[in-house]
Interface confidence: low
């Protein structure tokens, strides 16, 4: 019993003065607490607690369930205890069959003994099955058997407490161990879609999937830069023992422009946290934005091919697309396709393939697209570069030589005189008059140029060359002169 120096409060004394007492079932338990400041007796076993305000605790006919710790407390809060075993051959173990263990922690199989003098107090597997090889335990007759460092693999393990009583092995009722997994990784979070584009009034609904080893994972939808509480609904499933899934669905039944922003699904457990975001953009109405992939003014050589390409953003989805030239709609030669097969794609490509363009096929080519909210269009001005063609070359009644050429870009006409029969004309002749005939005509056709020189300046036989050229190429026509006496004759012009 405790002893302290005089003057200091001392713990109570218990009679009988032992730390443990063994009583046979049916016999009396009589415990006396000796203390001038006695307050109470307390009895504890498993989850049961009883109190007694009498300084003598008497149980006339002891039962196995009276096994436990009896504590006497005085007014100073000091206490002394005695542990009583009520030996009952028919009830060797007191049991609390609820058995939960946290992974990597110890857990107590609560099967205290009613007889401390039995041997081989241990754990056994049910139906003679062996316990896992790595399962270690520590027996304590007053408390039960502690399983050290519970493993996830022990989940649903069936076991008994066991002890040898008078040469026979006695088993307790069975226990089923339920293991609560430890979090050894952050939760896995994913979102149904990374971005949403909606019109005002449409419903926004997004689902976050949270996966972890148990349902005690915490999750919530948050809004970036806001503390506003969001309304969410949950569904959850256990796919096997340590495979838990929760779906948290956030819904805004009628989205507004000012609901636009970044929404975060956040999850955490004792190991750490994880998050995933989705972006919501709400527009007051749909839109179409067209981006030309080539210059909207196009120059192409006669006979060559050109592709007119646009990319465009359309929300909602485009419903009608067409390419138009001179009020005529193309039925073929074009294709329209989404830029990506992604479900949330809003970007598309349209291509018009113009092949072997003729000089007459220059002009405005227009792409038109519409959806349920808006229309949009873009125009390409196509110019076809053509080599000059000499349309006429004549000697006029007034003695002028005139050359008319057409092409694009606008041809330049130069004149040369070749004396005699030389074919290479080098001496240039200045024109008297140059006119662009259709400068005010249609903007995309060939440009026609007329140039004239005065033939009276030529005094010798020879050839006059009219040369029309532009960036694409050149063409020449020739006038032959022969003098008979004083008369000058124009011989057939030729190209």
């Amino acid at each position: 019993q405790p002893s302290v120096s005089p003057g200091e409060p001392s713990p109570p004394s218990i009679h009988p003065a032992k730390s443990e007492l063994i009583v046979r079932v049916g016999n009396e338990i009589r415990l006396l607490c000796i203390d001038p400041g006695f307050v109470k007796w307390t009895f504890e076993i498993l989850d049961e607690t009883n109190e007694n305000k009498q300084n003598e605790w008497i149980t006339e006919k002891a039962e196995a369930t009276n096994t436990g710790k009896y504590t006497c407390t005085n007014k100073h809060g000091l206490s002394s205890s005695i542990y009583v075993f009520v030996r009952d051959p028919a009830k060797l173990f007191l049991v609390d069959r609820s058995l939960y263990g946290k992974e990597d922690n110890d857990t107590l199989v609560r099967c205290p003994l009613t007889d401390p003098e039995v041997t081989s107090y241990s754990l056994k597997g049910c139906q003679g099955k062996p316990l896992p090889k790595d399962l270690r335990f520590v027996p304590d007759p007053k408390a039960g058997i502690t399983i050290k460092s519970v493993k996830r693999a022990y989940h649903r393990l069936c076991l008994h407490c066991s002890a040898d009583q008078e040469g026979k092995s006695v088993l307790s009722d069975k226990f089923i161990l339920k293991v609560r997994p430890a979090f050894k990784a952050v939760p896995v979070v994913s979102v149904s879609k990374a971005s949403y584009l909606l019109r005002e009034g449409e419903e926004f609904t997004v689902t976050c999937t949270i996966k972890d080893v148990s349902s005690s994972v915490y999750s919530t939808w948050k809004r970036e830069n806001s503390q506003t509480k969001l309304q969410e609904k949950y569904n959850s499933w256990h796919h096997g023992d340590f495979n838990y899934e929760r779906q948290a669905t956030l819904t805004i039944s009628s989205a507004r422009v000012n609901d636009s922003g970044v929404f975060m699904c956040y999850a955490n457990n004792t190991f750490g946290s994880a998050n995933v975001t989705t972006t919501l953009e709400v527009v007051d109405k749909g839109f179409i934005n067209i981006f030309p992939m080539i210059n909207t003014t196009v120059f192409v050589n006669d006979g060559e091919n050109v592709d007119l390409i646009v990319e465009y953003e359309a929300f909602p989805k485009p419903e009608h697309q067409q390419w138009i030239y001179m009020n005529r709609t193309f039925t073929d030669k074009w294709e329209d396709y989404p830029k990506s097969e992604n479900e949330s794609n809003i970007r598309y490509v349209s291509e018009l393939h113009l092949t072997r363009l003729k000089g007459t096929e220059g002009g405005t080519y227009t792409f038109l697209v519409s959806n349920s909210d808006v229309n949009a269009s873009i125009a390409f001005n196509v110019y076809v570069n053509t080599k000059p063609e000499i349309l006429t070359y004549d000697r006029l009644v007034n003695g002028m030589l005139q050359c008319v050429a057409a092409g694009f870009p606008e041809p330049t006409i130069d004149w040369y005189f070749c004396p005699g029969t030389e074919q290479r004309c080098s001496a240039s002749v200045l024109p008297v008059d140059v006119q662009t005939l259709n400068a005010s005509g249609p903007p995309f056709g060939k440009l026609v140029v007329q140039s004239s020189i005065d033939s009276s300046a030529f005094k010798h036989n020879g050839t006059v060359e009219c040369k029309a050229y532009n960036d694409v190429g050149k063409t020449s026509a020739y006038f032959n002169f022969a003098f008979k006496g004083n008369n000058k004759e124009q011989i057939h012009p030729h190209t």
């Epitope: 809004r223 970036e224 830069n225 806001s226 503390q227 506003t228 509480k229 422009v257 000012n258 609901d259 636009s260 922003g261």
Partner: antibody, heavy 122, light 106 residues
Framework: EVQLVESGGGLVQPGGSLRLSCAAS????????MAWVRQAPGKGLEWVAS????????YYLDSVRGRFTISRDNAKNSLYLQMNSLRAEDTAVYYC???????????????WGQGTTVTVSS | DIQMTQSPSSLSASVGDRVTITCRAS??????LNWYQQKPGKAPKLLIY???RLQSGVPSRFSGSGSGTDFTLTISSLQPEDFATYYC????????FGGGTKVEIK
């Protein structure tokens, strides 16, 4: 009429304490974010502290963190600023301001009180 | 912390003038910018929030524009009651105000 009225300002010595109050009326106080903004003599505006209406989370200017405490009593429609260890540079007119939000993503201050003057001087 | 720089710090203008005040943030604040007007001895008054949205009761001669780091407050035709000090304020990361622009009578 929506109104904020500050009180509790005055002259205090360096190292001293003051408690400012802001009485709100004309709106549901518990629904709004609240803040304190100050203006030193001849200077510009400086946000000091704010408190969220839903979570009770508090935010402070670095130079006042640990010395000032913002709090609210929704039952009394009141906002408070407890100022300890006051310094000369805390001398200013202190305004109580109501926070409203656009798009639930950020706050602006749409209603202001007339201000209460705090002078820290020996 | 996000620093807000206003320019000019003061300007002189006449009634009917078009006045432009600029505000620059030390880092991108998206469109989270507010403008306030303050007259001597009075509390500030909210003019514009979220860069360009006019607070209820504010005359339409006030307008705001910009995004990212550069913002502008424009008074299309200055009125006698507009002579005051104007402050910009960011709401991206906590709150900070610009140094103010005083609009005086020329």
């Amino acid at each position: 009429e929506v109104q904020l009225v500050e009180s509790g300002g005055g002259l205090v010595q360096p190292g001293g304490s003051l408690r400012l109050s802001c009485a709100a009326s004309g709106f549901t106080f518990s629904d709004y974010y609240m803040a304190w903004v100050r203006q030193a003599p001849g200077k510009g505006l400086e946000w000091v502290a704010s408190i969220n209406q839903n979570t009770g989370s508090t935010y402070y200017l670095d130079s006042v963190r640990g010395r000032f405490t913002i709090s609210r009593d929704n039952a009394k429609n009141s906002l408070y600023l407890q100022m300890n260890s006051l310094r000369a540079e805390d001398t200013a007119v202190y305004y109580c301001a109501r926070g409203d939000y656009y798009g639930t993503t950020y706050w602006y201050f749409d209603v202001w009180g007339q201000g209460t003057t705090v002078t820290v001087s020996s | 912390d996000i620093q807000m720089t206003q320019s000019p710090s003061s300007l002189s203008a006449s009634v009917g003038d078009r006045v432009t005040i600029t505000c620059r943030a030390s880092q991108s604040i998206s469109s989270y910018l507010n403008w306030y007007q303050q007259k001597p001895g009075k509390a500030p008054k909210l003019l514009i929030y979220y860069t360009s949205r006019l607070q209820s009761g504010v005359p339409s001669r006030f307008s705001g524009s910009g995004s990212g780091t550069d913002f502008t407050l424009t008074i299309s035709s200055l009125q006698p009651e507009d002579f005051a000090t104007y402050y910009c304020q960011q709401g991206r990361r906590l709150w900070s105000f610009g140094g103010g622009t005083k609009v005086e009578i020329k």
